[in-house]
Structures are given as structure tokens and as C-alpha cells.
Interface confidence: medium
């Protein structure tokens, strides 16, 4: 189920799957929620540690049992991912952090009158992921009212420094507040050029597009269908970016599908989950559990309820069935996508709905336990 | 909202506008989305207007002037007014609205978390009131959803300010000693929300107050934590699954 309690003065030992810099525990928790394997996180505020390298450190963690030993660490904050927390799942983060400079690649500098205007500029710039604003009282006069738009390889700051009269924050594109607008079109038999930022396997172009939308550096994508001429590239979803923010060229290519991230859509973003079930498809991955259930929908529900499960295959092979129940294979991978996709099998596959935000399965209380 | 500022899109995605369509259509009260099919509001919003079909509920909106005849709205399936509410008193000013059709959640339309039953231990220091109500006592309904940051006031302090009324444990007060920031007419039924450990919770429902934003006259809100049993009982569907954001 959904666990929202935060543990103050506590740090989870071990289980690290990723680390990054975040300005607070809530943003760290959000990154954990959207990470395919993260179940737990620990955050070190500036006040909690002298080691400058670990200040603002956000440590994403996994555990086979769903828990890890807690050690006392003054000032640290730990907690759970919000996977399975229904409507609380959101990549939108509105907070502005005073006295903090979030470092990254500065690609645009302009003079603005307020931090809100700076955030708006970031939200309306296709490449901007976060920003810093030097206030009117900044110690160097020439930098006052400067709005620095930034990005980084992972979408989070490369470093965070305590700095007076500087305010920082994130783009509000995940809040569906961008004025840019988005291209909903899917282009059949067209391949986009430019830089590949990631490669995953997906059953269709729509899953590819959703993954692109929630990837920090994906601006557009190309998907190679299951009838693409090169077998090893079938069902490959290439997440792409470019300096300009749009593809520099596109090539007519049979059995490819291309499109754009929907992060810049106004008013509505796709849910960060995939609800469709794919008949006759087998999703390969690391086996988490095998259970007998009645029907593919129950298999999907079972996967959704098991927090580490990312996708599933429901087998209809006679040897995998007992009376009305058949084997439900609960699986996971490093990146949350199947490691292989096979067609023509007796069964169906699909994804966990743990990141769907329409569920009523969420709870809303936060218990703070102080050790 | 007196002394407030404009909200931005999706900042308060649980806020709804309760409007009445008679000869003309107008905003009367606020409300809070607490589940796909449930809105929590003040009982007094239905004083004299208990007819379900005259009400229109707009969710996922920021600017009332954007509403046209084509703007989608929800209709009421059922109004559940607290059984102990009396117009002549301030007590039990709470009502549930069951919508005819469930709403999908988006960044601009999603529920607010409810507090734990009888939540008395949490100290809330970051509380906001929102609504399209008057910006001054003799004002008018605002187009853009307003927000204002207001501190909670102890019931003991609140009782001192309202000697002629009983401030019960089922009420919560919020306001500045010097006044200037408050809810006002048209904000009734809307949310008083507080952020605690990164999570917003519905602490109060805008109910009453002496004028608006007056010195030493805090706003009085229905304390949601005190009505959790009632909310859960009323929102429980026939299959026994709670249809709203229930607490742990």
C-alpha cells in the first residue's frame, strides 16, 4: 500500500540504486517515486552534514523486503516512494528555494523582475529543467535580477550550494503549465535524427511517448515496430534530444514511428503509467514472483499491489494453468521496461499500474516519527 | 479572500466552484474535491437551495470568467447535510456532495488529503485559504481564484474574540491579530489547507466570521478532523470501499 510517513533524524542503510542532489526531501521523494526501482529514500539537508559533497544528497534505495535498517543521523530525512499512492503521484514541484543555488549547465541568462517571472521563463523554455535567480540584494551588482535557465544530464542539479540572495526552483512543465504547447501527432514511417539520450523496449509508440514525456532529457522519440527489418532493433524506443529542441532532420523509414514529448502540453499530461494489456505478447525480465490467478486483469492487479513489480506476463499455456487459474509472472528490470518483447505467445502482458494517479488506493496521512 | 493574491493553474487542484443556475448563473460557494465522486463543502451553502438540479460544480478551473455554456460541469447526485446542522447555529457546518459522474484526476483536478480522525497533535504552521469570494466586506466575487496564507489561532484565543458564540472543539480558527487577511463572502465551503511534511491536508471548511479580515476577529472553520467518522460513513459505497481520500 501507500506509505507516506517521513522519518526524521533517520537514514536508510544500504540498498542504493541512484544518488543525486535535490533541494529538499519532498523533491527527493518525487524522484524516488518516478525511479523504476526506488522504494525508499534518504535525504541529507545542508544542516545535517559537514561533508560538502554530500550536502543536499538524495539517495534512492531498493530492497527485496521493501524495508532497510534505519540508522540515526541528526537532520537526515528518510521515507518511502509514493508508488501506489494514487493522486499524490505527480512530477510537479512548485516550491522556490531561498538562499540556494542549484548548479547545472547555464544556457540562458536574462534580467527579470521577480523569481516567479524567472520560473515562468524556465517553464516556457523547452530545454530548461531548473533555474536560479539572483535577487536585487545579491552581493554582486552586475548579477542582480539575473535569471539563469539550466539543465543537466539527469534533470537534477549537478550541485546545490547555499548562497545568500539567490532563489532556485524547477520548471513547471510537469505541472502542465507550459505555454509552449505540444505536438500530439504521431508520425508513421518517419525516423528522427539527433542525439539518443536513452534506449528502452516498449510494445508500442504510445508507451514510448509516455516514457519520453517523463524522461528529464527526452524531447522527441523514434520507435521501431515489431516488424522492423533488423530483428535486434524491434520494439526499440529511442529517446532523443537536440540543441534546438526539435529534430534537425527526419527520414522516411518504413516500420518506424516518431513523435514528441508531451511535457510541454498545456492543461493535460499523460499519466505516468501504461494501462493497456497486450495479447499474444511476452514481456521478459527478472522474475519477482509467480502466482496462480484467474484472468489477466487479476494478474495486472497483483502486479500493481506488489510494489516492486514493474510488468507482468499472464500465461495461457495448458501446462501453466490449473482449472480456472493460470500463471501470472511478476517481473522487473533495471529501467522499468521489459528486457525483451516476444510475440505470438499464448498469453498477455502489461505494466503495473502503481504510478497511475487515478487510483483510490492512496492514503493521505503523514506520521512523523522522531527517533 | 481579503488580502490575497492570484493563484496559478493547478496550485489548488481540489478547489471547486459551486454555482447556481436559476434565471442567471452565479458562484455561491467553494468546495473541496475529496474523491472521484465526492466534494466536501459547508452545509450553509444549501440554505434555501437544497434542490440538486439547480447546482453546477466546476472543477479544474482558475478563472470564473473563462466559464462559458460549453464548459463542462458536474451535477449533483446527492446532497448530504450533517444531521445536526441548524441554520440558526454555527455548529456542524459541513456537507457532502455526491457527483452524478466520477471525475478523472489531472494536475488541475485532484483531491485533497483528509486529516486523521481527531487530529489534535499536528502543529500546522503553513496554512492557506482559497476562494473566489469577496476581496473586501462590501465587495464582489473575484474572477481569478485567490489564495491567502493565514495562521491558525487557538480555540481559546478564538473564543475570547467571539464572546457571544460558542467556539467548539469541532471548529478551528485562523486569522491575524491585526486583521487584513481572511476569507469572505463567497468563500464559504472552500478549503483551509495546511502543508505538513510536504503534504497538503484539508484542515478546515470556510464557515463564518464577523465581517471579513477585521482586527481580532478570526475566521471560523469547520474542523474536518472532527468529522472523519461522519465523512467515512457517508462516503462508504455499497461494496464497502471508501470512495474518497481516506486517512490511514
Amino acid at each position: 500500500g501507500c506509505l507516506t510517513q517521513l522519518y526524521e533524524n533517520a537514514f536508510f542503510r544500504g540498498g542504493d540504486v541512484a544518488s543525486m542532489y535535490t533541494p529538499n526531501a519532498q523533491y527527493c521523494q518525487m524522484r524516488c517515486t518516478f525511479h523504476p526501482r526506488c522504494l525508499l529514500f534518504s535525504f541529507l539537508p545542508a544542516s545535517s552534514i559537514n561533508d560538502m559533497e554530500k550536502r543536499f544528497g538524495c539517495f534512492l534505495k531498493d530492497s527485496v523486503t521493501g524495508t532497510l535498517p534505519k540508522v540515526h543521523r541528526t537532520g537526515a530525512v528518510s521515507g518511502h516512494s509514493l508508488k501506489q499512492c494514487g493522486h499524490q503521484i505527480s512530477a510537479c514541484h512548485r516550491d522556490i528555494y531561498k538562499g540556494v543555488d542549484m548548479r547545472g549547465v547555464n544556457f540562458n541568462v536574462s534580467k527579470v523582475s521577480s523569481v516567479e517571472e524567472c520560473q515562468k521563463r524556465c517553464t516556457s523554455n523547452i530545454r530548461c529543467q531548473f533555474f536560479s535567480y539572483a535577487t536585487q540584494t545579491f552581493h554582486k551588482a552586475e548579477y542582480r535580477n539575473n535569471c539563469l535557465l539550466k539543465y543537466s544530464p539527469g534533470g537534477t542539479p549537478t550541485a546545490i550550494k547555499v548562497l545568500s540572495n539567490v532563489e532556485s526552483g524547477f520548471s513547471l512543465k510537469p505541472c502542465a503549465l507550459s505555454e509552449i504547447g505540444c505536438h500530439m501527432n504521431i508520425f508513421q514511417h518517419l525516423a528522427f535524427s539527433d542525439v539518443d539520450v536513452a534506449r528502452v523496449l516498449t510494445p508500442d509508440a504510445f508507451v514510448c511517448r509516455t516514457i519520453c514525456t517523463y524522461h528529464p532529457n527526452c524531447l522527441f522519440f523514434t520507435f521501431y515496430t515489431n516488424v522492423w527489418k533488423i530483428e535486434s532493433q524491434r520494439n526499440v524506443c529511442l529517446l532523443k534530444t537536440s540543441e534546438s529542441g526539435t529534430p534537425s532532420s527526419s527520414t522516411p523509414q518504413e516500420n518506424t514511428i516518431s513523435g514528441y514529448s508531451l511535457l510541454t502540453c498545456k492543461r493535460t499530461l499523460p499519466e505516468p503509467c501504461h494501462s493497456k494489456i497486450y495479447p499474444g505478447v511476452d514481456f521478459g525480465g527478472e522474475e519477482l514472483n509467480v502466482t496462480f490467478v484467474k484472468g489477466v486483469n487479476v494478474c495486472q492487479e497483483t502486479c500493481t499491489k506488489m510494489i516492486r513489480c514493474q510488468f507482468f506476463t499472464y500465461s495461457l499455456l495448458p501446462e501453466d494453468c490449473k482449472e480456472e487459474k493460470c500463471k501470472c509472472f511478476l517481473r522487473l528490470s533495471m529501467d522499468g521496461s521489459p528486457t525483451r518483447i516476444a510475440y505470438g505467445t499464448q498469453g498477455s502482458s502489461g505494466y503495473s499500474l502503481r504510478l497511475c494517479n487515478t487510483g483510490d488506493n492512496s492514503v493521505c496521512t503523514t506520521k512523523t516519527s522522531t527517533r | 479572500i481579503v488580502g490575497g493574491t492570484n493563484s496559478s493553474w493547478g496550485e489548488w487542484p481540489w478547489q471547486v466552484s459551486l454555482q447556481v443556475k436559476l434565471t442567471a448563473q452565479r458562484h455561491l460557494c467553494g468546495g473541496s474535491l475529496i474523491g472521484h465522486q465526492w466534494v466536501l463543502t459547508a452545509a450553509h451553502c444549501f440554505d434555501g437551495l437544497p434542490l440538486q438540479d439547480v447546482w453546477r460544480i466546476y472543477s479544474g478551473i482558475l478563472n470564473l470568467s473563462d466559464i462559458t455554456k460549453d464548459t463542462p460541469f458536474s451535477q449533483i447526485k446527492e446532497i448530504i447535510i450533517h444531521q445536526n446542522y441548524k441554520v440558526s447555529e454555527g455548529n456542524h457546518d459541513i456537507a457532502l456532495i455526491k457527483l452524478q459522474a466520477p471525475l478523472n484526476y489531472t494536475e488541475f483536478q485532484k483531491p485533497i488529503c483528509l486529516p486523521s480522525k481527531g487530529d489534535t497533535s499536528t502543529i500546522y504552521t503553513n496554512c492557506w485559504v482559497t476562494g473566489w469570494g469577496f476581496s473586501k466586506e462590501k465587495g464582489e466575487i473575484q474572477n481569478i481564484l485567490q489564495k491567502v496564507n493565514i495562521p491558525l489561532v487557538t480555540n481559546e484565543e478564538c473564543q475570547k474574540r467571539y464572546q457571544d458564540y460558542k467556539i467548539t472543539q469541532r471548529m478551528v480558527c485562523a486569522g491575524y491579530k491585526e486583521g487584513g487577511k481572511d476569507a469572505c463572502k463567497g468563500d464559504s465551503g472552500g478549503p483551509l489547507v495546511c502543508k505538513h511534511n510536504g503534504m497538503w491536508r484539508l484542515v478546515g471548511i470556510t464557515s463564518w466570521g464577523e465581517g471579513c479580515a477585521r482586527r481580532e476577529q478570526p475566521g471560523v472553520y469547520t474542523k474536518v478532523a472532527e468529522y472523519m467518522d461522519w465523512i467515512l460513513e457517508k462516503t462508504q459505497s455499497s461494496d464497502g470501499k471508501a470512495q474518497m481520500q481516506s486517512p490511514a
Partner: antibody, heavy 122, light 106 residues
Framework: EVQLLESGGGLVQPGGSLRLSCAAS????????MMWVRQAPGKGLEWVSG????????VYADSVKGRFTISRDNSKNTLYLQMNSLRAEDTAVYYC???????????????WGQGTMVTVSS | DIQMTQSPSTLSASVGDRVTITCRAS??????LAWYQQKPGKAPNLLIY???TLESGVPSRFSGSGSGTEFTLTISSLQPDDFATYYC????????FGQGTKVEIK
């Protein structure tokens, strides 16, 4: 918005009868004490009669006792004043109003109707 | 029955003047007293209830005080819009109005 709308006034001969109505909207009529207040031309306000929420308790000013009857129909949100044996001194604007009790709500409030004129003259 | 006596019955004043109207009840009515303003041809308008509580939207130059049997309505600085007739009303036991005070231009 709270509204009270009186009707039924007019010219009537001494000894005659009239029935005034007051249609209420914008509040839960059945919970409130309602009353009639009148104002003779150029004179002050005079309370005439009151009726409690259930309709079971009715009270009258001495000047109208035995001649006037106050009643209400909660299903129709309407207050009535049946006036019999009318006299010249009953000539006035008749207002319907409600007893404002309870807490000051965060919604609009207006406790008086605009009045209906009753003229008793031969 | 409770009688309400208002004084003066007429009061001549100029714009900017401080004006005081008193109301006396024949027996204690606690704080259950309201003050109304009425202009010719219009319904009365509630100014103050519970003796001293200003009705929402009423200018702060109006104030009320008193309890028991003695009550006062004060207009701190008379404005052109304030020339009207003022009534007190008790609602402790049923309802009774004072006879009114007409505030006219001096």
C-alpha cells in the same frame, strides 16, 4: 442570496380582509423565526407578529391580537399574514423579515423584503 | 412587554459632526439590541446587532455600545449619505422598535 418578496397588499374598506404573502429564498426557511413589521406613512417601525420555525408558536403585538393571523408553509417557503377586521390605523407598508440568529455566515445577507402597501379607507 | 425609548426624536447636524443616539429599554435585554438605518421609501438596513457588532459592509464610522438597558449608536463623522432615520430594536423577548431618530441637515 437571501430574498424576501411580499405581495397581496392593496386598497380595502374598513372591516374588510386581506391576505399578505412573503416568498422566501436563499436560506432554509423552515429553520427560522419569521415576522411581520409595518410602518404607517410618516411613522416609525412597529413589530406586528412573529412565528417560530415549526409554526407551532405564534406571537402578536397587542394592537393586532385577535384580528391578524400569521402562518407559514415550509414546503412552499412562504409566510402569510391573514388580516381581518381591518381599521384605518392598519394602513401601512408591511414588511416581512426574519429573526437573524446564529453565527455571521460567510455568505450574503439581507433580512428585509421591500414591503407591500396596505391602505384601509372607505 | 418591553418598551424601547429612543432619544432625541430629531437631531440636526452637519457633515463631519460626531452624532450620538441613545436607546433605553424598559427592562434588561442583555446585548440583544440592533440598530437600523432607513431612508424614505426603502426597507430598513441593519447597521449593528448584538449591541456593538458592526454588520458586514457597514462603514466603520458607525459604532454601538451598551448592555442591559442603556444603549448608544455613534456616528463618528457624519457623511452626506448618513442623513436618515435610525431605529433601535430589541430581540430579547419578541421584538420591539424604538420610535426612531431622524438625523437631518442643520
Amino acid at each position: 442570496e437571501v430574498q424576501l418578496l411580499e405581495s397581496g397588499g392593496g386598497l380595502v374598506q374598513p372591516g374588510g380582509s386581506l391576505r399578505l404573502s412573503c416568498a422566501a429564498s436563499g436560506f432554509t426557511f423552515s429553520h427560522y423565526i419569521m415576522m411581520w413589521v409595518r410602518q404607517a406613512p410618516g411613522k416609525g417601525l412597529e413589530w406586528v407578529s412573529g412565528i417560530y420555525s415549526s409554526g407551532g408558536i405564534t406571537v402578536y403585538a397587542d394592537s393586532v391580537k385577535g384580528r391578524f393571523t400569521i402562518s407559514r408553509d415550509n414546503s412552499k417557503n412562504t409566510l402569510y399574514l391573514q388580516m381581518n377586521s381591518l381599521r384605518a390605523e392598519d394602513t401601512a407598508v408591511y414588511y416581512c423579515a426574519y429573526q437573524r440568529t446564529g453565527v455571521p455566515r460567510r455568505d450574503s445577507f439581507n433580512i428585509w423584503g421591500q414591503g407591500t402597501m396596505v391602505t384601509v379607507s372607505s | 412587554d418591553i418598551q424601547m425609548t429612543q432619544s432625541p426624536s430629531t437631531l440636526s447636524a452637519s457633515v463631519g459632526d460626531r452624532v450620538t443616539i441613545t436607546c433605553r429599554a424598559s427592562q434588561s435585554i442583555s446585548s440583544w439590541l440592533a440598530w437600523y438605518q432607513q431612508k424614505p421609501g426603502k426597507a430598513p438596513n441593519l447597521l449593528i446587532y448584538k449591541a456593538s457588532t458592526l454588520e458586514s459592509g457597514v462603514p466603520s464610522r458607525f459604532s454601538g455600545s451598551g448592555s442591559g438597558t442603556e444603549f448608544t449608536l455613534t456616528i463618528s463623522s457624519l457623511q452626506p449619505d448618513d442623513f436618515a432615520t435610525y431605529y433601535c430594536q430589541q430581540y430579547n423577548t419578541y421584538w420591539t422598535f424604538g420610535q426612531g431618530t431622524k438625523v437631518e441637515i442643520k
